[in-house]
Interface confidence: low
């Protein structure tokens, strides 16, 4: 299953399959997730080691048993690949690293006014993988405001150095934020020239294209079909690059197919997995296991659940079958692709779905209406779980926020439905940033069921929580994916990085905002909060957040939206925006429904609604 815990001061011994430099443990974990054989990783921050060569070292590891012995190493961080972790699988990495220079091939330098602009330039350059920006206080005046666009053979820095007044980061192309746009066309009977960066075997051009999209240096590809004249080259997928970023020439060639990486697509990228099953095809590779199962779909599920399995063949040969079950061959290779593809066989083959980010149909857990005052504009995909709950009567308007917690589930505040319990009048918009982008053609979700907490009473602050079951499940994308829930009764975690988001009023007597706002707010103890609200009972099922001096808070229109906190690189839904005395007033923190206290209720309702478990635990 999915394991998300990180081990501090621990290093996995042995099992190395690759090593590289990464700026932090989260990026190292992402590289492990996308490496075909990596199950475990260990990362050495700069502070953990004197050896300059090993600083920022990211070590990717494999293990037949799925685990390795841990040795104590001060400062080291270790953890698991996020294969099998559904919507948490993403190649998108937004963080900016201050005081760090990520080294690589510098191929472009320009003057820009901010690190954000430098990141945008990298994202809009087809060859840029990462960048470094020298701030206005950099010690050498001639380098100030320099934006260096970089690449490397493996897509990760060739070295990382601690350097004052330098900020570094990665291209946001994997976040589907590139302005370049992409070529969706596939060109029949055409071969591209230029430099081959890798060669893999694939059953069709679409798998070849997806592999190209997630390969750090592939910009375009040529695929030789299973009827290509040279037998040894059949099903070969050549991943290619060029100095210019486009093919310098192409040759008409029967039974070849060419196309481009889709990494530069805006707003949507293909999933990093291949779900198609190929009848009459055998995939060869290293044997991991052989099991008897009923049907090719069960064989694929078995491969997906066995974390080391990369692809499979389900044999229908009479000697491989007994009763209704046949042999399911679970296989792997060094590069994650079959080592041989044979046609016209009695088998059906396919790939593990361990990297599919749709995951299962679950919500994600780990073991007065009130909007954002004093906030700033959010950017695309920053809060992909945020939804807008709108009511369409004569006109349509935004009333509340909400949080996507599963393909078909939204968590919000019960008071959003005060006086409006009819599910037909509600429209739920997900994957949006600007309310003004909503037109009559914008897709929205309708409500199948509103589940208000049984103990909630109108105009009382207690049990202000409601679940919405959507009529149809949503697909996950970089801009629309769920937030993980805390573990039941989570009281031990100390959250220091918490944010509230919403389109609500920017001042007490204001109006709904167009761009989704965000504000960083510290949590306040319940004792402190109770002192500020002596006329109300602050229960242990509430959590408070706010600045003593005020100025930043949720407000009208933010209700039902998320209070999220980042811990160990993972966002969790800690609170639901509920109520407060005015907005952003001095010594009047916002009050939020404490999600951890309602985990049993959430589990019960999401399970009983359609009779099967809806919860999935990444821990």
């Amino acid at each position: 299953g999915c394991l998300t815990q990180l081990y501090e001061n621990a290093f996995f011994r042995g099992g190395d399959v690759a090593s590289m430099y990464t700026p932090n443990a989260q990026y190292c974990q992402m590289r492990c997730t996308f490496h075909p054989r990596c199950l475990l990783f260990s990362f050495l921050p700069a502070s953990s080691i004197n050896d300059m060569e090993k600083r920022f070292g990211c070590f990717l590891k494999d293990s037949v048993t799925g685990t390795l012995p841990k040795v104590h190493r001060t400062g080291a961080v270790s953890g698991h690949s996020l294969k099998q972790c559904g919507h948490q699988i993403s190649a998108c990495h937004r963080d900016i690293y201050k005081g760090v220079d990520m080294r690589g091939v510098n191929f472009n330098v320009s003057k820009v006014s901010s690190v954000e602009e430098c990141q945008k330039r990298c994202t809009s350059n087809i060859r840029c993988q990462f960048f470094s920006y020298a701030t206005q206080t950099f010690h050498k005046a001639e380098y100030r405001n320099n934006c260096l666009l970089k690449y490397s053979p493996g897509g990760t820095p060739t070295a990382i150095k601690v350097l004052s007044n330098v900020e570094s980061g990665f291209s946001l192309k994997p976040c589907a934020l590139s302005e370049i746009g992409c070529h969706m066309n596939i060109f029949q009977h055409l071969a591209f020239s230029d430099v081959d960066v890798a060669r893999v075997l694939t059953p069709d051009a679409f798998v070849c294209r997806t592999i190209c999209t997630y390969h750090p240096n592939c910009l375009f590809f040529t695929f030789y079909t299973n009827v290509w004249k040279i037998e040894s080259q059949r099903n070969v997928c050549l991943l290619k690059t060029s100095e210019s970023g486009t093919p310098s020439s192409s040759t008409p060639q029967e039974n070849t197919i060419s196309g481009y990486s889709l990494l530069t697509c805006k707003r949507t990228l293909p999933e990093p997995c291949h779900s198609k099953i190929y009848p009459g095809v055998d995939f060869g590779g290293e044997e991991l296991n052989v099991t008897f199962v009923k049907g090719v779909n069960v064989c694929q599920e078995t491969c997906t659940k066995m974390i080391r399995c990369q692809f499979f063949t389900y044999s229908l040969l009479p000697e491989d079958c007994k009763e209704e079950k046949c042999k399911c061959f679970l296989r792997l290779s060094m590069d994650g692709s079959p080592t041989r593809i044979a046609y016209g066989t009695q088998g059906s083959s396919g790939y593990s779905l361990r990297l599919c980010n749709t995951g299962d149909n679950s919500v994600c857990t780990t073991k007065t209406s009130t909007r954002i005052v004093g906030g700033t504009n959010s950017s695309w995909g920053e809060w992909p779980w945020q939804v807008s709950l709108q009511v369409k009567l004569t006109a349509q308007r935004h009333l509340c926020g909400g949080s996507l917690i599963g393909h078909q589930w939204v968590l919000t505040a019960a008071h959003c439905f005060d006086g409006l319990p009819l599910q037909d009048v509600w429209r739920i918009y997900s994957g949006i940033l600007n309310l003004s982008d909503i037109t009559k053609d914008t897709p929205f979700s309708q409500i199948k069921e509103i589940i208000i907490h049984q103990n909630y009473k109108v105009s009382e602050g207690n049990h202000d929580i409601a679940l919405i079951k959507l009529q149809a499940p949503l697909n996950y994308t970089e801009f629309q994916k769920p937030i993980c829930l805390p573990s039941k009764g989570d009281t031990s975690t100390i959250y220091t990085n918490c944010w509230v988001t919403g389109w609500g009023f920017s001042k007490e007597k204001g109006e709904i905002q167009n761009i989704l706002q965000k504000v960083n707010i510290p949590l306040v103890t319940n004792e402190e909060c109770q002192k500020r609200y002596q006329d109300y009972k602050i229960t242990q099922r509430m959590v408070c957040a706010g600045y003593k001096e005020g100025g930043k808070d949720a407000c009208k229109g933010d209700s039902g939206g998320p209070l999220v906190c980042k811990h160990n690189g993972m966002w969790r839904l800690v609170g639901i925006t509920s109520w407060g005395e005015g907005c952003a007033r001095r010594e009047q923190p916002g009050v939020y429904t404490k999600v951890a206290e309602y985990m049993d209720w959430i589990l019960e309702k999401t399970q009983s609604s359609d009779g099967k478990a809806q919860m999935q635990s990444p821990a």
Partner: antibody
């Protein structure tokens, strides 16, 4: 130029048999998966059967399983469909088509041959 | 088996208009969706494969989009020769299945 030419259709009584042929030219026949698709008069398209390039793997629609047999002779560039125990509901135009297995679509079709099952 | 639901079953349009036909799969089929055109007494002809890829020789007024379960065929600027029956087909899994067809007629 790629060409597929079906033959062998005609009128047959229920319970009878027919053998359809599809002669291929203009491409390397032995490299391609081939399929039969049928279309009842005024109705939709229905996949009937597929055969791999070598002939080693065959697949059938549930409605014809056990009654129809697909085969090919790569030396003669010909695809066959042996139809036994024919029923009135098998009445249709039968098309052979070339299956681009790498991308999964039917890029060339024959002109079709009509099979009528009636007493 | 994967069911393919095509709509509408018939569509009346004029020369120069745009026409849109939709196809829905009973389960996700990624981009393995193909569109064919058929004229009376003739065999079907491939227009679009892989949901959005235009077969060579097919006019650019034909376009396809979609992935997963919902797909669309659009014909912009209808020409007299475009009035025919259109079929969608999934090639994600055998048995290949077709939609019920859409007859595009002249208004």
């Amino acid at each position: 130029e790629v060409q597929l030419l079906e033959s062998g259709g005609g009128l047959v009584q229920p319970g009878g048999s027919l053998r359809l042929s599809c002669a291929a030219s203009g491409f390397t026949f032995s490299f391609y998966k081939m399929i039969w698709v049928r279309q009842a008069p005024g109705k939709g398209l229905e996949w009937v059967s597929s055969i791999s390039s070598s002939g080693g793997s065959t697949q059938y629609a549930d409605s014809v399983k056990g009654r129809f047999t697909i085969s090919r002779d790569n030396s003669k560039n010909t695809l066959y469909l042996q139809m036994n125990s024919l029923r009135a509901e098998d009445t249709a135009v039968y098309y052979c088509a070339r299956d681009r297995v790498d991308l999964g679509y039917l890029d060339y079709w024959g002109q079709g041959t009509l099979v009528t099952v009636s007493s | 088996d994967i069911q393919m639901t095509q709509s509408p079953s018939s569509l009346s349009s004029s020369v120069g208009d745009s026409a849109t036909i939709t196809c829905r799969a009973s389960q996700s089929i990624s981009i393995y969706l193909n569109w064919y055109q058929q004229k009376p007494g003739k065999a079907p002809k491939i227009l679009i494969y892989g949901a959005s890829q235009l077969e060579s020789g097919v006019p650019s007024r034909f376009s396809g989009s979609g992935s997963g379960t919902d797909f669309t065929l659009t014909v912009s600027g209808l020409q007299p020769e475009d009035f025919a029956t259109y079929w969608c087909q999934q090639s994600y899994n055998v048995p290949y299945t077709f939609g019920q067809g859409t007859k595009l007629e002249i208004k």
